[in-house]
């Protein structure tokens, strides 16, 4: 819990350089996000493909989309879970991080120093050990987050199942209902290829309790979709006399000394005439 209150932002006096004053873990160990570069990567043959169970959500069900002042968050059902980790990890929510229209490079994790346009996080908690996400969030092995790197490219109808509701959650505290859809459609091709490391929440309180899975391959959304994400939302309430746009809601990469990131893949991707091999 914070020492004094819970006000934090990505910019200004309450920006990330100040987080550790109120949230000591933000200046502590195992902080995320990180840069994924070759000298810290090690292939681990035991990293088998994850299975995504209960990800196909019925459209007859309603799921709450919320502007929490930091991101846009979609609540997920507790019977949606990942199989293939040491415990069962049940879904709790997904949210996104992005940049701004003039610098659309807002992913949290970087690859060889390069940002992607945005990043999706699907947050799960250890439901074998803990009753809910908030209990799990400060416990060892408590959380597992799937991270999807997003690049600008072609229109993505699956991501639009979230983006089409952004106008109803323009301001902090606003909530809308989203029909269920197949969350697995938000994941990239070849989900068996991923980076794995132990890290933290990328937002206060920055608990170092997250098992990260960052998928190797990005997904694409269109320039128009990215622009909608970068321009639709505000960090402030509707009646705030000083509205603040919700942009650049990503944390800078953190030091990653004397540790390794494990990969489920060994080969280098080579571009050939036939595509990626």
């Amino acid at each position: 819990a914070p020492v004094n209150g819970s006000k934090w932002t990505y910019f200004g006096p309450d920006g990330e350089n100040s987080w550790s004053k109120k949230y000591p873990s933000c200046g502590g160990l195992l902080q995320s996000p990180i840069d994924l570069h070759s000298d810290i990567l090690q292939y681990d043959a035991s990293l088998t493909p994850l299975e995504f169970q209960g990800y196909n959500l019925s459209a007859n069900k309603q799921f709450l989309l919320t502007n929490n002042g930091h991101s846009v968050k979609l609540n997920l059902p507790s019977d949606m879970h990942i199989q293939g980790l040491q415990s069962r990890y049940s879904a709790t929510q997904l949210h996104l991080h992005w940049g701004n229209p003039n610098d659309p490079h807002g992913s949290e994790h970087t690859v060889s120093g390069q940002h992607f346009a945005a990043e999706l996080h699907i947050v799960h908690y250890n439901s074998d050990l803990y009753p809910d996400a908030s209990t799990a969030s400060n416990k060892s092995e408590g959380l597992a987050v799937l991270a999807v790197l997003i690049e600008m490219g072609s229109f993505n109808p699956s991501y639009d199942k979230i983006f089409s509701h952004l106008q109803h959650v323009k301001y902090k505290g606003q909530e809308a209902f989203v029909p269920g859809f197949n969350i697995e459609e938000l994941l990239p091709e070849r989900t068996a290829e991923y980076y794995r490391y132990r890290g933290s929440l990328t937002t206060p309180p920055c608990n170092p309790t997250v098992l990260w899975t960052v998928f190797r391959n990005p997904v694409q959304i269109s320039q128009e979709q990215l622009l909608a994400l970068e321009t639709a939302l505000y960090c402030t309430h509707m009646d705030d006399p000083s509205p603040r746009e919700m942009i650049n809601n990503f944390r800078q990469v953190q030091k990653f000394d004397e540790r390794l990131v494990y990969t489920s893949f060994s080969q280098v991707q080579v571009c050939t005439a036939a595509g990626l091999s």
Partner: antibody
């Protein structure tokens, strides 16, 4: 035939609590959320909250958070609404309802007959 | 919360009259739904997704609108149409209903 049947209404003392039941039949119970909606005498409709019978996940109208608890017994195809610290303004007919998706959003296609709760000393 | 304001709150009309009920939302919504309720009965789905008639609803009923302004129209009022009509939005949490429009016999 798809049916929802509420029960459990009656006279409750101010400060007391109520537990209403909504028994469902005629469809695959876990495929649809169950909503509770109330209607005070001569007034409009007001949403209280809903439950996903598949997993017990609940969502409430902020107005009722902390005072209303919705639960489910899958083996009985029945949802429950518990409301505490009742006051005269909670006097209403309480309905359960099922929303169905039609291609963009949902509408309530099935309603129970309602059960009247009167809060009075 | 999105407030839904129906007008009029009640109206008296004769059989055969054309009747229009308006529902105004305090913020734009994607679709509007309408329910019919008769005394002592539960509401029934009447019009969904702004303009689609629920099963069994006669074609003299129609719905239209977008953004914040929506209407339910009865082209030729029949005796069985005397009831209270409620609009409802599902775009934002909490989902909200209008206060109702009671259609009475003149």
């Amino acid at each position: 035939e798809v049916q929802l049947v509420e029960s459990g209404g009656g006279l409750v003392q101010p400060g007391g609590s109520l537990r209403l039941s909504c028994a469902a039949s005629g469809y695959s119970y876990t495929d649809y959320n169950i909503y509770w909606v109330r209607q005070a005498p001569g007034k409009g409709l007001e949403w209280v909250g809903y439950i996903d019978p598949a997993n017990g996940d609940t969502t409430y109208n902020q107005k009722f958070k902390g005072r209303a608890t919705i639960s489910v017994d899958k083996s009985k195809n029945t949802a429950y609404l518990q409301m505490n610290s009742l006051r005269a303004e909670d006097t209403a007919v309480y309905y359960c309802s099922r929303p169905i998706y039609y291609g963009a959003y949902w509408y309530f296609d099935v309603w129970g007959q309602g059960t009247l709760v009167t809060v009075s000393s | 919360d999105i407030q839904m304001t129906q007008s009029p709150s009640s109206l008296s009309a004769s059989v055969g009259d054309r009747v229009t009920i308006t529902c105004r939302a305090s913020s734009p919504v994607t679709y509007m739904h309408w329910y019919q309720q008769k005394p002592g009965k539960a509401p029934r789905p009447w019009i969904y997704a702004t303009s689609s008639l629920a099963s069994g609803v006669p074609s003299r009923f129609s719905g239209s609108g977008s953004g914040t302004d929506f209407t339910l129209t009865i082209s030729s009022l029949q005796p069985e149409d005397f009831a209270t009509y409620y609009c409802q939005q599902w775009s934002s949490n909490p989902l909200t209903f209008g206060q109702g429009t009671k259609v009475e016999i003149k």
